[in-house]
């Protein structure tokens, strides 16, 4: 017997949509051969109607897709728009057609159930309005209208023209008789529940000379959207709930095994701890859509998710819902990468983050979630140079190593530093990344001095001291800039004496500006690296004054653990604020992006063995 | 909560049909799966059919191999109650027939037991002659 398996039969009406679900053994073989959706024949031929290879029959063309899912071992057919001439015998499938693995399903796509003459179906989403319309006669228009709802063999009044309105429809409902000449009054539904469902009779007048009118209301559960996303990776629920909610609050939530649904985040100002430093919800557009992006995915956020709109900011019974069921796929194509990089108050982190390597050409882009309200992420600095003014001299976003990763260089760190960062480009929406950066006890590994003051034309000596642990490593003085940090030449001047209990592999590397220049002055980085993949650094600032004495300055290392004194930056911080994001030059697909925090992980010279997830920068 | 009630065991000789039912009651869901599991005696919990269905009137109904063409899943018009129409049975039918649900569609196989919530006590069916 085959070990594919799926729905042996699926009935279902014209004009409507099937997704049939077929379950493989998701074997490594089986996850990635060709599956397939054919028709059987009378001569027992199975035509291919649509497969993963992308083959769309004419058809089928534009109402039918198939979507493997590896990492569940099923495949789903979609197929939109049946007619009767869909029903007939089926195969789905994986390999060739006549000798794969298969399953046999029957479709059978019926007519719909008989209505009365003339009509009128409806056919509206739950938590919608629908406005139904009663024509009616001129001898009829000054008697009462009336939508009545028919349950069996009786017919139930809903609301009529002289005030009456059924409890059930209390608050949502109203009855509009348009103004002489019009011969049509409309009902309308606000906040459709699936009660509503059934059979409407529309009244004018009454006895023999009445008017009627038929309508057939179908209110529809939304059928979860199939979203499948990489570990680690992101996902966007893109939400669009219409223009009668545009003002009420809205709310993303996740079924439970209750069958309740758990708000995620809301515009009310509630999140889950559960998504802290990985969600944000897009400000709505003047239509009452937004959108909620989640970074870092866990294989635990697994489920399905809605979202809605009302005051309370959580799922009620009646407002409009948009539904997604998430899957998030294992075989993640998107790095392991630390989600926690450790620092220490003085030092540095380098954080690794990962990008499309196909879109090697994408800007590149750092920002600090912040979750105040919905969440937003203003941008610290990006690969074109801009950085905050705050964060000048402290912060590099480097292209190296490539091929798929950048790296992000912060020194300087101080408890404020602690918190989420989110790593994205304006390519590839699914690789956002997250990054928690914690500030932890310990002493900087490099030791650099304080602020160091140059004298015009005269040679300035400024000392690096590198511990034992690092002698391995690349060593390099470099001049940081907003486009990033021009690497200088140095000089290794042998051990050094900062560092006691500790072998010849302790270095000290100087760096020397002769003669020093107006040019000269701004912020000096040391650090470590391994090929392209940077360490820790350490940063100096050199202010450059008028010569006073004659002779040359060289800054002792007995000064070299001083601490640095704080650059006094210009107050007015530029801000980049979420409008920013939302410029389509940034995100070629999604205005979203700006409000999304981004975090970014640190990778740093030292790291923590306790866990794979966490990098560590503190001193052994 | 869902509560699920089976009735419609019994005791049939073999080649004899019989009628199961499983009435939900509770909060009711427009989208559903509902399925049958079997246990004979001694045995592991099996699969036996499964339902599912949109709120738009679209089916799809499941078989395990030993019962295609002899059972016949099926849903009534009060949308409340699942039958499974048993034809042609054999002693290897015997066993307590469980009924199950899931109100949020199935996503994963719907042969398995983990896709369902809710649960009924079970209708002991017994074939012999």
């Known amino acids: 017997k085959s070990p594919v398996f799926g729905p042996q039969e699926v009935s279902s009406v014209e004009g409507n949509s099937v997704s049939i679900k077929c379950y493989y053994p998701p074997t490594s073989v089986n996850r990635h051969t060709r599956k397939y959706w054919c028709r059987k024949g009378a001569s027992g031929r199975c035509i291919t109607l649509v497969s993963s290879e992308g083959y769309v029959s004419s058809n089928y063309a534009g109402r039918a897709n198939l979507t493997n899912f590896p990492e569940n071992g099923t495949f789903v057919v979609n197929i939109a728009q049946l007619s009767r001439d869909d029903s007939g015998h089926y195969k789905c499938g994986l390999g060739i057609n006549s000798r794969g693995l298969s399953f046999d399903v029957s479709l059978e796509v019926s007519q719909g159930p008989e209505l009365p003459n003339g009509t009128e179906v409806y056919t509206v989403d739950v938590g919608r309005t629908v406005t139904i319309k009663c024509p009616f006669k001129t001898e009829n228009a000054p008697k009462t209208k009336a939508l009545y709802k028919k349950i069996g063999q009786t017919s139930v009044l809903v609301i009529d023209s002289r005030n009456y309105v059924n409890p059930n429809y209390k608050d949502r409902i109203r009855l509009r008789i348009p103004g002489t000449g019009q011969l049509i009054f409309t009902v309308v539904i606000d906040r459709l529940r699936l009660s509503d469902h059934g059979l409407y009779l529309c009244q004018a007048g009454d006895g023999s000379n009445r008017d009627e009118k038929n309508a057939d209301l179908q209110v529809l559960e939304p059928e979860p959207e199939l979203v499948y996303e990489d570990l680690r990776g992101s996902v966007t629920f893109h939400c669009a709930l219409g223009l009668e909610v545009a003002n009420v609050a809205k709310f993303l939530c996740r079924v439970n095994s209750r069958e309740t649904c758990d708000v995620v985040i809301n515009t009310l100002g509630k999140r889950d701890s559960a998504f802290e430093g990985r969600i944000l919800l897009n400000p709505q557009d003047k239509d009452g859509s937004f959108s909620v992006v989640i970074t870092g995915l866990r294989k635990e956020d697994e489920g399905r998710y809605l979202c809605g709109a009302h005051s309370d900011g959580q799922l009620q019974e009646g407002w409009p819902i948009q539904a997604w069921q998430l899957f998030v796929n294992e075989e993640s194509t998107i790095p392991r990468s630390p989600t926690v990089v450790k620092g220490v108050a003085g030092g540095s982190v380098a954080v690794l983050c990962p990008y499309n390597p196909k879109e090697s050409q994408s800007l590149k882009y750092w920002c600090l979630w912040e979750g105040a309200q919905n969440g937003r992420c203003p941008l610290l600095v990006e690969s074109q140079g801009l950085v905050q003014e705050q964060y000048e001299g402290r912060l590099s976003l480097l292209q190296e190593p490539g091929n798929g990763t950048f790296t992000v260089i912060l020194n300087q760190l101080t408890t404020q530093d602690a918190g989420f960062y989110w790593c994205l480009t304006n390519g590839d929406t699914r690789w956002r990344t997250t990054v928690e950066i914690k500030i932890i006890e310990g002493e900087p590994n490099l030791k650099v001095p304080g602020n160091v003051t140059a004298v015009l034309g005269e040679t300035l000596n400024i000392p690096c001291h590198f511990p034992c642990k690092f002698s391995s490593y690349e060593k390099y003085w470099c001049k940081w800039s907003n486009t990033g940090c021009q690497t200088l030449p140095s000089q290794d001047e042998g051990p050094s004496e900062a560092f006691v209990n500790c072998d010849e592999n302790s270095r000290l590397v100087s760096l020397t500006l002769n003669p020093v220049t107006r040019a000269d002055e701004g912020w000096y980085w040391c650090g470590v690296k391994q090929g392209h993949f940077y360490g820790e650094t350490a940063a100096v600032y050199v202010a450059v004054e008028e010569k006073k004495v004659a002779g040359s300055r060289y800054v002792s290392p007995a000064k070299a653990d001083a601490a640095p004194d704080e650059k006094v930056l210009d107050s007015g911080v530029r801000e980049i604020e979420n409008k920013a994001i939302q410029d389509p030059r940034l995100f070629a697909e999604e205005k979203v992006v700006a409000d999304t925090g981004d975090q970014a992980g640190g990778s740093r010279a030292s790291v923590d063995s306790s866990s794979s997830e966490e990098q560590g920068g503190s001193s052994k | 909560e869902v509560q699920l009630v089976e009735s419609g065991g019994g005791l049939v000789q073999p080649g004899g049909s019989l009628r199961l039912s499983c009435a939900a009651s509770?909060?009711?869901?427009?989208?559903?799966?509902m399925g049958w599991f079997r246990q004979a005696p001694g045995e592991e919990r099996e699969f036996v059919s499964a339902i599912s269905w949109s709120s738009d009137g679209t089916y799809y109904k499941y078989y395990t191999d030993t019962v295609k063409g002899r059972f016949t899943i099926s849903r009534d018009n009060a949308e409340t109650t699942v039958h499974l129409q048993m034809n042609s049975l054999k002693p290897e039918d015997t066993a307590v027939y469980y009924c199950?649900?899931?109100?949020?569609?199935?996503?994963?196989?719907?042969?398995?037991?983990?896709?369902?919530?809710?649960w009924g006590q079970g209708t002991l069916v017994t074939v012999s002659s």
């Open positions: 199950a649900a899931s109100s949020s569609g199935t996503y994963g196989d719907p042969r398995s037991e983990r896709e369902y919530r809710y």
């Open positions: 509770g909060r009711t869901f427009s989208s559903y799966t």
